[in-house]
């Protein structure tokens, strides 16, 4: 703490702020009739250096003069930018065991003169905002610098601000507070500013702009969007804007888009009509303005405005699919199922589908309306017989798509050859054929369709399926692949009144089964053996079941057993084996095989022959 | 009702000092803009200068660096200070005071609300 220098005095040369890099000079005078005892020499005057308030330096070594008893003169050099305090005390000699008492003190402030401003803008945010002008001040002084903004306009007016810089505070921003008016349009600015501290000072070049290259207009606000007789393309938007905007830029986009519809819109006058609107689609539409055509700034997007448009009629056709199962002599049931529409063509919620079965001789008709994307019935089995579908929203149905209901796999000449499934990756399989060799008519398309091969799967769950054009000999499938699980994959060959089909299991991954298949019985049967077996768990066989195995040796043999490779067929779950020698006891087990390998072997049973074998 | 009262008028050498006072009542000067007019014999009365609410100074040309606004919120007054008088400063100057925003708006007469009497500012040779 500094007293307050009842003691004397201490003054600095040449001033208390010097440049970086210079000498000072600190005289500390002790006043009249102060001091340690009645001789003047035992009063010792010291000078400590602090920074930051820690004592750095004792200046004793320092003295360039020395009037004895009455002051001292310190010479202080490499003063390190910013503020250091020096202190002035009395240390009495003849008494060692006092401390120094302070006489006074005093700040040196090291800095630098202030570079000229530079890089200054001006912005007024709206015609009725306030000019504010930013700028670069170059290297800290380290001293406090007044900086003056000056703007000089028409009608030889000028107008200024001042803000300071120092180790608290920066100043490189100023906002006069007062707006230019929009009747000034035409006029020049001149704006500069400038720098002072103790060391010196020093002016911007003068940077000249007009009311609008710096006015920003206020982003546009109260949008909103009128849809022409409820239409879901055609809307105006509408918004307010500042009087003095002459340009608009729009932007609008469905709202999980990634690019932006852009528009320029010259003289709007807050109005605008858009006529490529999706229907039935969320939408984010902004607006930004600009108050010259050619110079001066864009304002800031507006706020966001979301709506949806309004739906309209659906569009586009519904890909539709059936299945035949005959249920007695003179009838059947038909399944029809359908994709539901993409949004772009759905154009509105789908309240139902329009679903129809004609005979087409008789002209019988069965009509019904369903909220789901599948519909059966059962029918004669005689009689030419085509469906016909077709999806409604609160603005209109679609166009029907019609389909003609034949035999799917009644004609061998049109069933597709070399039929392939290659596993692609983890979820897809690319099934691949050749053209029906001797077809009598010509393949209007393929149809690919596709179902997990689990039970239940045929009643449960509905068949995916692709169009494929008839000029295409393959399909990747990737609706509701997963791996470890195996497909039947079927390729329907169709003409006008026709259907040919070919069959195939596939899997887009594999694993050796779990487990091997569970022998359930064997049974003797004019000296052959039958073996009987339960198939493995859906879960467990973790792909395409190619072939199983049944293996047998003789009990407590070391010898390898010898195998018989069956193979797979879902609907088989017996076999017959006839290389056994009778009254000899076997153990029999089985495994089954995938393309990744074979499973460990299921439960073991011992048999005795006891027939004659072969 | 607000009231504008100028003082410290009177008469100076050439080259001399006058620090001009308007005391406010009725309204506070730190939420308005203050300006000072002055007309003289036989003339329009014509800007001086002006303080916006926001502390921005503007002058004309004419008298920058000779005349300095300042604001005294204590005392609810304005201050011009004008140095190195000339006799063509000699007319009689005017307080007044307003909620003006705009460059311009600050050296146009008609955007004040409020006025003073004046007080007469004699120069002589």
């Known amino acids: 703490n500094i007293d307050v220098c009842k003691l004397g005095t201490v003054t600095v040369q040449p001033a208390p702020v010097i440049p970086l890099g210079s000498a000072a000079n600190i005289s500390c005078s002790l006043n009249p009739k102060q001091g340690c005892s009645h001789y003047p020499s035992s009063n010792e005057l010291i000078l400590l250096k602090f920074v930051n308030d820690v004592l750095v330096e004792n200046l004793h070594g320092k003295k360039v003069h020395d009037h004895t008893g009455h002051s001292s003169t310190f010479q202080v050099t490499n003063l390190s930018l910013g503020m250091t305090l020096f202190v002035c005390k009395l240390n009495c000699s003849n008494s060692q065991k006092k401390p120094p008492v302070p006489v006074c003190g005093v700040e040196i402030s090291v800095g630098v003169a202030p570079e000229p401003p530079q890089n200054i803008s001006c912005v007024q945010e709206g015609e009725n905002g306030t000019v504010a002008c930013s700028w670069n001040s170059g290297k800290v002084t380290y001293l406090k610098t007044n900086y003056t903004l000056q703007l000089s306009g028409p009608n030889n007016l000028t107008c200024q601000k001042q803000c300071f810089s120092d180790n608290r505070q920066n100043c490189n921003r100023l906002d006069l507070g007062i707006n230019l008016s929009p009747d000034l349009a035409e006029s020049r600015f001149i704006v500069r500013v400038t720098a002072i501290n103790d060391l010196g000072n020093s002016s911007s070049l003068p940077h000249t702009f007009t009311f609008l290259d710096i006015v920003i207009p206020l982003p546009p606000w109260d949008i909103r969007i009128n849809f022409l007789n409820a239409s879901g393309s055609r809307g105006t938007l509408q918004w307010e804007d500042e009087g003095q905007v002459v340009l608009n830029q729009l932007r609008y986009q469905p709202l999980n888009s990634t690019s932006w519809n852009m528009v320029n819109a010259t003289n709007a006058k807050g109005k605008y009509d858009l006529r490529d609107l999706r229907p039935f689609t969320e939408y984010e539409f902004q607006i930004s303005s600009k108050l010259h055509l050619s110079g001066g700034s864009w304002s800031n997007w507006s706020e966001s405005l979301r709506t949806r448009t309004p739906e309209e009629e659906p569009v586009g056709i519904l890909d539709i699919w059936y299945m035949k199962q005959d249920i007695d002599y003179d009838r059947q049931q038909i399944s029809l199922f359908w994709k539901s529409l993409n949004p772009s063509e759905a154009r509105g919620k789908i309240l139902h589908y329009q679903v129809t079965l004609q005979e087409v001789t008789k002209k019988t008709t069965l009509q019904n309306t369903t909220r789901h994307t599948s519909w059966t019935r059962v029918i004669p089995r005689t009689g030419a017989w085509t469906a016909s579908v077709s999806a409604a929203n609160s603005k209109g149905a679609s166009a029907p798509t019609h389909i003609n209901i034949v035999d799917l796999c009644g004609t061998g000449l049109l069933a597709p050859h070399q039929v392939s499934a290659k596993s692609e990756n983890m979820d897809n399989i690319l099934v691949t054929w050749q053209p029906p060799k001797k077809a009598d008519s010509a393949v209007r398309e393929y149809i690919v369709e596709w179902r997990a091969l689990q039970p239940g799967s045929i009643t449960k769950f509905p068949p995916h399926w692709l169009r494929i054009p008839p000029d295409n000999m393959s399909a990747l499938i990737s609706e509701n692949i997963k791996p470890y699980i195996c497909y039947e994959i079927r390729v329907h060959a169709l003409s006008e009144s026709q259907g040919g089909c070919s069959s195939i299991r596939g899997d887009s991954k594999h694993k050796a089964p779990v487990s091997g298949p569970h022998i359930t019985a064997i049974t003797e049967k004019k000296e052959r053996l039958f073996i009987s077996w339960t198939h493995i768990p859906f879960p467990e066989q973790r792909g395409c079941i190619l072939h199983y195995r049944i293996y047998w040796k003789e009990r407590d043999s070391t010898a390898q057993p010898e195998l018989c490779e069956i193979q797979y067929r879902r609907s088989q779950n017996s076999h017959p084996i006839s290389s056994l020698q009778p009254r000899v006891t076997y153990v029999l087990w089985m495994t089954a095989v995938t393309a990744a390998g074979e499973s460990p072997q299921g439960n073991e049973r011992e048999f005795c022959p006891q027939g004659k074998a072969n | 009702q607000v009231q504008l009262q100028e003082s410290g008028g009177g008469s100076v050498q050439a080259g001399g000092s006058l620090r001009l006072s308007c005391a406010v009542s009725g309204r506070p000067v730190s939420d308005y803009a203050m300006g000072w007019f002055r007309q003289a014999p036989g003339k329009e009365r014509e800007f001086v200068a002006a303080?916006?609410?926001?502390?921005?100074?503007v002058y004309p040309n004419s008298v920058k660096g000779r005349i300095t606004i300042s604001r005294d919120n204590a005392k609810n007054a304005v201050d011009l200070q004008m140095n190195a008088l000339k006799p063509e400063d000699t007319a009689v100057y005017y307080c007044a005071m307003g909620p003006i925003g705009t460059f311009q708006g600050l050296a146009r007469q008609n955007e004040y609300h409020y006025w003073g009497q004046g007080t007469q500012v004699t120069v002589s040779s």
């Open positions: 303080l916006s609410a926001s502390d921005t100074t």
